[in-house]
């Protein structure tokens, strides 16, 4: 893709249900620019159905999140830093989720616990990006009757069968100055060969993930293009009449401050229902994770602890995390108390975000670390390594990655 810029704004909204948008496992994050701030299409797919503990498969339901891309041996490295020496503890910043499918669907990446999967309250990092290949279906993607993945649905109007996701983070992709939305984890971007997802939680860690429900999205699929069309009022007069009829005074929005402050950058462009289809997932396989440090994040199942390994993931020199000020991101585990910061991620065409399957945030399982916090992401140090600081953004990205991998069973 031609270096689409993605702005990631993590929106922690614990309150409503979000319509989940499709998330491309690889490369493309579906970015939905919801005209309604309320609508949060999370990329993460919440499993429409939570698999039963007995392992029985519920049709189309994948309940695990997959999250990172293993490097040779990292591939084998457990979430917990159990890999053999030299292995990158399975934490590869990129988990390539099959383009278009979630790791969960593919069965790759972290394995979310039912609890995680069932959690409707999830922090979702949504990267809305354009995917090359909008194909790819997720069992768990929220789809309309037509089978198309719905992108943004207003809160409270989550697509049927989908669990509402509360903390949805959406990341708008190159879209007009619309409010940024934090990326939500859902299906990993599909385009790619590598999407920048990291799967934070591992199967063994039921709450280790940032409580992001695993979405059963297909593996590394390239995102589908979804257009959210909101039809503008047919005529100004009609709009007026409608407004006039409403005796309710219009709220003084001037004094209203968006939760995320995203409205600050909003520019209203007349044209009423212009809908932009931002669903094109970014081919993260070419995305360079500019967060260089993501490579060092290892997801350890069980705990929310993130261990930063000194080993640098081999992103093939193509992945550079551009998340820049992750250092400023602070995730407060355990509650909706999160600090959301907006960061622009520039995915370069040649950058390979290993988040597809490669970026794995390793969390220590409670057993291992005893840390029960959902996830501790460290800040990225100047060296590019993540210094154990909470980073909601990383978490959401990781969640996205994990979700797509999960679909694939990776």
């Amino acid at each position: 893709m031609a270096e689409p810029r993605q702005e990631f704004e993590v929106m922690e909204d614990h309150a409503g249900t979000y319509g989940l948008g499709d998330r491309k496992d690889q490369g493309g994050y579906t970015m939905h620019q919801d005209q309604e701030g309320d609508t949060d299409a999370g990329l993460k797919e919440s499993p429409l159905q939570t698999p039963t503990e007995d392992g029985s498969e519920e049709p189309g339901s994948e309940t695990s999140d997959a999250k990172s891309t293993p490097t040779a041996e990292d591939v084998t490295a457990p979430l917990v830093d159990e890999g053999a020496p030299g292995k990158q503890a399975a934490a590869q910043p990129h988990t390539e989720i099959p383009e278009g499918t979630t790791a969960e669907e593919a069965g790759i990446g972290d394995t979310p616990s039912l609890e995680d999967e069932a959690a409707g309250h999830v922090t979702q990092a949504r990267m809305v990006s354009k995917s090359k290949d909008g194909t790819g279906s997720d069992d768990k993607k929220a789809k309309g009757a037509d089978g198309k993945t719905k992108i943004a649905t207003p809160r409270g109007a989550a697509p049927p069968g989908q669990k509402g996701q509360a903390n949805a983070t959406r990341i708008p992709a190159k879209t007009p100055p619309a409010p940024k939305t934090p990326p939500s984890s859902g299906e990993p971007p599909k385009s790619g060969d590598r999407s920048g997802y990291s799967s934070p939680g591992s199967p063994g860690t039921p709450g280790s993930r940032s409580r992001t429900p695993s979405l059963p999205t297909p593996p590394t699929r390239e995102p589908k293009k979804v257009a959210v069309v909101r039809t503008p009022p047919k005529s100004p007069s009609s709009a007026k009449s409608r407004l006039q009829t409403a005796p309710v005074p219009m709220p003084d929005l001037k004094n209203v401050k968006s939760k995320i402050g995203s409205t600050e950058n909003l520019k209203h462009q007349p044209g009423g229902g212009k809908v932009q289809i931002v669903y094109k997932p970014v081919d993260l396989s070419k995305v360079t994770s500019k967060c260089g440090s993501l490579g060092n994040i290892h997801h350890k199942p069980g705990g929310g602890q993130v261990e930063v390994k000194s080993e640098k993931l081999d992103f093939k020199d193509r992945v550079q995390s551009k998340i820049g000020s992750l250092d400023n991101i602070t995730h407060v585990p355990g509650g909706g108390n999160k600090k959301i910061e907006t960061h622009k991620l520039t995915f370069r065409e040649n950058a390979k975000a290993k988040t597809d399957h490669g970026a794995e945030i390793v969390y220590k399982s409670p057993v291992v670390s005893g840390d029960t916090s959902p996830r501790h992401l460290s800040n990225v140090s100047s060296t590019g390594s993540i210094d154990m600081v909470d980073s909601p953004q990383l978490a959401t990205l990781a969640d996205e990655v994990s979700a797509s991998l999960a679909k694939q069973g990776l």
């Epitope: 491309k24 496992d25 939570t50 698999p51 039963t52 392992g55 498969e57 519920e58 189309g60 695990s64 997959a66 041996e73 591939v75 490295a77 457990p78 159990e82 990158q88 399975a90 590869q92 990129h94 989720i97 099959p98 278009g100 593919a106 069965g107 790759i108 990446g109 972290d110 394995t111 979310p112 616990s113 609890e115 995680d116 999967e117 194909t135 790819g136 279906s137 060969d193 590598r194 591992s202 199967p203 063994g204 860690t205 297909p218 590394t220 699929r221 390239e222 396989s285 997801h299 350890k300 199942p301 069980g302 597809d356 399957h357 490669g358 399982s365 991998l405 694939q408 069973g409 990776l410």
Partner: antibody
């Protein structure tokens, strides 16, 4: 050292069921998906499905829906794949393979269990 | 039949470069990452390439994968006798909603 050790060869009759186990060691069992892939004699690989070792959630290939059941016992870090209503064409080597966490693929495989279905 | 298409065989002499093709469609390779496996006679498959072009540690850099559109070739440069094996490509298929493999390519050195 990651290791996936599968149970021994089995000979079954048509209509019977077979349950293959995959004992895992060397990594956090619940942190990865376990996939099952089979390979008929002289044939290629065929994916059967996966189980989320952590939650027990499963996903099966359409071809095996209704006949395969994947389970796991986290206490003994073992995954199981049971295939019922066996037919002669189910004769194959059944592999358990770990879903890569950091990439797209199956990073570790069991040695395989040969299941022979004889009339 | 296999969803992903691979040539049944390929051969080369030591030192040569051999490329194995793996072609599919928009619902699989076109939209998902590809992985490659090497299966030596009588053994279980081994991950060779994951996420299109990533090599697990321990895999010689002679093996390289790539993906373009709906095709994902595996190249083996500097062919060696120990490379004689069966190679399988795999990816997720959105339509089938499952993993799919190629029929395998037997490489003879």
């Amino acid at each position: 050292q990651v290791n996936l050790r599968e149970s021994g060869a089995e000979v079954k009759k048509p209509g019977a069921s077979v349950k293959v186990s995959c004992k895992v060691s060397g990594y956090t069992f619940t942190g990865y998906y376990m996939h099952w892939v089979r390979q008929a004699p002289g044939q290629g690989l065929e994916w059967m499905g996966w189980i989320n070792s952590n939650s027990g959630a499963t996903k099966y290939a359409q071809k095996f829906q209704g006949r395969v059941t994947m389970t796991r016992d986290t206490s003994i870090t073992t995954a199981y794949m049971e295939l019922s209503s066996l037919r002669s064409d189910d004769t194959a080597v059944y592999y358990c393979a770990r879903g890569a966490r950091d990439g797209y693929g199956f990073d570790y495989w069991g040695q395989g269990t040969l299941v022979t279905v004889l009339a | 039949s296999y969803v992903l298409t691979q040539p049944p065989s390929a051969s080369g002499t030591p030192g040569q470069r051999v490329t194995i093709s793996c072609s599919g469609g928009s619902s699989n390779i076109g939209s998902n990452a590809v992985s490659w496996y090497q299966q030596l006679p009588g053994t279980a498959p081994k991950l060779l390439i994951f996420t299109n072009d990533q090599r697990p540690s321990g895999v010689p850099d002679r093996f390289s994968g790539s993906k373009s559109g709906t095709s994902a070739p595996l190249a083996i440069s500097g062919l060696q006798s120990e490379d004689e094996s069966d190679y399988y490509c795999a990816t997720w298929d959105d339509s089938l909603n499952g993993w799919v493999f190629g029929g395998g390519t037997k490489v003879t050195v």
